[in-house]
Interface confidence: low
């Protein structure tokens, strides 16, 4: 028989106490300690160096304590794919930069997603046709601009349609073709800052007789030999919080799977051997699961619906956990600063 | 009514098919694609640059394919705490290096665990007492050795008990005391290589009048001002596989929660837009859960036993998942190399 007023409160209180006990045993187990080091508050005072490195650790590192987390904090997107390399093929340029239909090559398109990444490396790759004998080749990259009225015949160069952005002297020895890479990071930064300035580029690679060895024609017959841009990027994987789990408080009447607040207070345990944090927010999961409610893996419900022999249904469990930083005395009276994984419940779900 | 022969086989086959479908939808969703890019095998051949960076990606990165994983591979220890900083307090030296009971300071003890870490930084911190007026202080660190019979009075120095390993000239201005740090990485390396050579050190810091300003007495009255060693370490978190989950094969009669093999073949889907891998091992979870069997969080069973309103019991679900690397065409005919999280089931458990 459940007490009046709050039928789920007794259960929740029980969960809370069990979670606290479990946290104590987990900390000892994760720190590889058989029992709590026997270090009193007085001994801590004697042993704790009044020295810069300790202060630095305490200042620099977030020991979570009672710091409030803003509700709309950015969190790691652990669901979507992260992009590491983008290879963008050369496309035809805009007619505005073409004279008599040339140059058709090369424009490179970048999505807004790529433009908001940190570019670690950007290289333009150009295929140079084979030369019959060793030769010095001068490769140049010209940045295209639409032709403006002024400066066409004479003038101060304000209307220049081509601006050289890279030049390279290459010694070719091979009778087979050669892929040449050109660092393009600076140019890319300027394009990403001002996407409207990206009208494309022209690529030439002249040998001493003036023959252009660069494969830039985008027509058939040169499959796989067209210029392309290789980007190594670092994504900002912080995304605004995707509310994938319910958050409740102690007064909630929610019966579904939910995350509840729980503060662990080490001083209340009498654990003086933990220097920092003195307390932290651990949280816990509690509540019922329906088949289709908030599953960790989107496909789980399908499997479960068809499951004649598995468990009766999904369970309310942490689907995302995070570590805490801890500064503590070990059983040899050494001070250790480290990270204990899986000590904070960030999200609850049915899985 | 279950078919004869293998009562769980039909369920498993169902799980398998659902997991495959789920993987397809997850890949598209995680790559932020509304549908599979419409790129045929012929178009792939045309667009794919025959160029070094593509080859490099294919050579350098593990696309998992059909590569067999050795059963006893090392995996990340995601359970135990990782140590980042160790602060080791000065202790009394061994009597073998003391003459007339001195020097008592300083010996530093390091556990085998710390000795097997990579030491990024090692600093000895020494507190220097305040000086009444600005002064030049000569700080020296002597490495102690046990006194051997030969060469005690004079001689060739073979029996020398002190070897200077650090000397430092410090300009002191402050009327308050001063913490001085001394780089100790090289000494530490030699101690870690030959622990038997660590007999401790003696520290002096003499002002022009010959007063030793270094606080080295380990008795009371100088709490928090004793010398200590600060180490920044990088642990090898790879541990031999802890078998926290059962592995089964299709012919197994295991009814408990278990991990089953499942190979995803993109060519069989007709997904030519995925350049690599062409296939990968995804695995899936299936089976029954008892209260106390293989729970993800050691304390879960306590909460569940007392749960009058939660799910009927824990469920068989992935407790560790890992990403796959993928090289693919997106919907803009760009080639992307990236990582898709949570695509391989590494471990199943009841949680």
């Amino acid at each position: 028989p459940e007490p009046d007023g709050c039928p789920v409160c007794v259960w929740r209180q029980h969960s809370r106490e069990l979670r606290l006990e479990s946290i104590k045993s987990q900390i000892l187990s994760k720190l590889r300690l058989k029992e709590a080091p026997n270090i009193s508050r007085e001994v801590v005072k004697q042993l704790l160096p009044k020295a810069p490195p300790l202060q630095q650790i305490l200042d620099l590192h977030d020991f979570q304590g009672d710091a409030l987390q803003p509700e709309d904090f950015l969190e790691e997107d652990e669901y979507h794919a992260t992009t590491e390399t983008v290879i963008s093929m050369a496309q035809e340029t805009d007619p505005a930069v073409q004279t008599d239909g040339s140059p058709l090559c090369c424009h490179f398109h970048f999505s807004p997603k790529v433009m908001f990444t940190k570019v670690l490396k950007a290289q333009l790759w150009v295929y140079l046709r084979p030369v019959p004998r060793p030769a010095t080749v001068y490769l140049q990259i010209l940045r295209l601009k639409p032709l403006t009225g002024e400066g066409t015949a004479g003038g101060g160069g304000g209307g220049r349609r081509h601006i050289r952005i890279r030049s390279l002297k290459i010694e070719l020895h091979s009778r087979s073709g050669h892929w040449q890479s050109i660092d393009f990071k600076q140019v890319l930064h300027s394009w990403f800052r001002q996407p409207q300035s990206n009208w494309g580029i022209e690529i030439n690679a002249f040998d001493p007789s003036g023959t252009d060895l660069a494969v830039t024609s985008l027509g058939p017959g040169a499959e796989g030999l067209h210029p392309f841009m290789e980007l190594r990027v670092l994504e900002n994987t912080k995304r605004s919080r995707r509310n994938l789990g319910l958050d409740c408080d102690e007064h909630s009447s929610e019966s579904r799977c939910c995350r509840y607040p729980l503060t662990v207070d080490f001083e209340a345990f009498g654990w003086d051997w933990i220097i920092a944090p003195k307390r932290y927010k651990a949280n816990y999961c509690s509540g019922q699961c329906e088949y289709m409610f908030m599953q960790k893996y989107p496909h789980t419900h399908l499997v479960q619906q068809a499951n004649p022999r598995g468990s009766a249904g999904p369970c309310c469990t942490p689907t995302k956990m995070s570590p805490i930083n801890m500064l503590y005395f070990n059983d040899k009276q050494q001070i250790i600063y480290g990270k204990i994984p899986g000590m904070v419940v960030d999200r609850c779900g049915c899985s | 009514p279950e078919p004869d022969g293998c009562p769980v086989c039909v369920w498993r086959q169902h799980s398998r098919e659902l997991r495959l479908e789920s993987i397809k939808s997850q890949i598209l969703s995680k790559l932020r694609l509304k549908e599979a890019p419409n790129i045929s095998r012929e178009v792939v051949k045309q667009l794919l640059p025959k160029a070094p960076p593509l080859q490099q990606i294919l050579d350098l990165h593990d696309f998992q394919g059909d590569a067999l994983q050795p059963e006893d591979f090392l995996e990340e220890d995601e359970y135990h705490a990782t140590t980042e900083t160790v602060i080791s307090m000065a202790q009394e030296t061994d009597p073998a290096v003391q003459t007339d009971g001195s020097p008592l300071c300083c010996h530093f003890h390091f556990s085998p665990k710390v000795m097997f870490t990579k030491v990024l930084k090692a600093q000895l911190w020494v507190y220097l007492r305040p000086v009444p007026r600005p002064a030049t202080v000569y700080l020296q660190i002597l490495r102690l050795k046990p006194l051997t019979g030969e060469g005690t009075a004079g001689g060739g120095g073979g029996g020398r008990r002190h070897i200077r390993i650090r000397s430092l000239k410090i300009e002191l201005h402050s009327r308050s005391g001063h913490w001085q740090s001394i780089d100790f990485k090289q000494v530490l390396h030699s101690w870690f290589r030959q622990p038997q050579s660590n007999w401790g050190i003696e520290i002096n810091a003499f002002d022009p009048s010959g007063t030793d300003l270094a606080v080295t007495s380990l008795g009371p009255g100088a709490e928090g001002l004793h010398p200590f060693m600060e180490l920044r370490v990088l642990e090898n978190t790879k541990r031999s596989r802890r078998n926290l989950g059962l592995d089964c094969d299709e012919h197994s009669s295991e009814s408990r929660c278990c991990r089953y093999p499942l190979t995803v073949d993109f060519e069989a889907f007709g997904w030519d837009w995925i350049i690599a891998p062409k296939r990968y091992k995804a695995n899936y979870c299936s089976g029954q859960c008892e209260y106390m069997f293989m729970q993800k969080y050691p304390h879960t069973h306590l909460v569940q036993q007392a749960n009058p309103r939660g799910s009927a019991g824990p469920c068989c679900t992935p407790t560790k998942m890992s990403p796959i690397n993928m090289l693919y065409f997106n919907d803009k005919q760009q080639i992307i190399y990236g990582k898709i999280p949570g695509m391989v089931v590494d471990r199943c458990g009841c949680s």
Partner: antibody, heavy 123, light 107 residues
């Protein structure tokens, strides 16, 4: 072997005109921008004008703008400098020079140079 | 326009000595700088381009360095044929401009 051979220099009175020529060989003339550079007696070098590989673009130093015209005939592999309204300060050795790069007029360095031709403007 | 200033105007050295020629731009030209050698009665000859790249056929004793506004041409050990006038030239922006030259003469 890349070569530039100049002709057309001489003595001319102020206000008169003169045309310089520069015959190119040993490279694809029609692929390269070309320049004129001059050097007054005992003085340094001064860039005069540039023309694009196809003759569609040309640029001039302020000191000659409106008086000099650079042109080319790709069928004859020849570069020209038409100098009108000549002044005493135009007295110099005039060099034609191949732009190091091909294509549109870039502001570049020169390799090789012609042997030079002396223009003396004097009454 | 960008003004190029070379120093010293004259450098008197003996064969085998090291020559260091300086060129300063009135504003940054990145690495868009060339060096030329000119002997009496001859056309200039390209030595260095892009501040530090030796042109084809130029001996290794010639080297260029610098970027932005300050550049140096170094001849590690003077040969008799190296005594000449040296010019720097910027091609960072229009119009192209040359320095006044440094005359390297035999001491």
């Amino acid at each position: 072997q890349v070569q530039l051979v100049q002709s057309g220099g001489g003595v001319v009175q102020p206000g008169r005109s003169l045309r310089l020529s520069c015959a190119a060989s040993g490279f694809t003339f029609s692929s390269y921008a070309m320049h004129w550079v001059r050097q007054a007696p005992g003085k340094g070098l001064e860039w005069v004008a540039v023309i694009s590989y196809d003759g569609s673009n040309e640029y001039y130093a302020d000191s000659v703008k409106g008086r000099f015209t650079i042109s080319r005939d790709n069928s004859k592999n020849t570069l020209y400098l038409q100098m009108n309204s000549l002044r005493a300060e135009d007295t110099a050795v005039y060099y034609c020079a191949k732009d190091f790069w091909s294509g549109y007029p870039q502001y570049n360095w020169f390799d090789p140079w012609g042997q030079g031709t002396l223009v003396t403007v004097s009454s | 326009e960008i003004v190029m200033t070379q120093s010293p105007a004259t450098l008197s050295l003996s064969a085998g000595e090291r020559a260091t020629l300086s060129c300063r731009a009135s504003q940054s030209v990145s690495n868009y700088l060339a060096w030329y050698q000119q002997k009496p009665g001859q056309a200039p000859r390209l030595l260095i381009y892009d501040a530090s790249n030796r042109a084809t056929g130029i001996p290794a004793r010639f080297s260029g360095s610098g970027s932005g506004t300050d550049f140096t041409l170094t001849i590690s050990s003077l040969e008799p044929e190296d005594f000449a006038v040296y010019y720097c030239q910027q091609y960072g922006s229009a119009p192209l401009t040359f320095g006044g030259g440094t005359n390297v003469e035999i001491k």
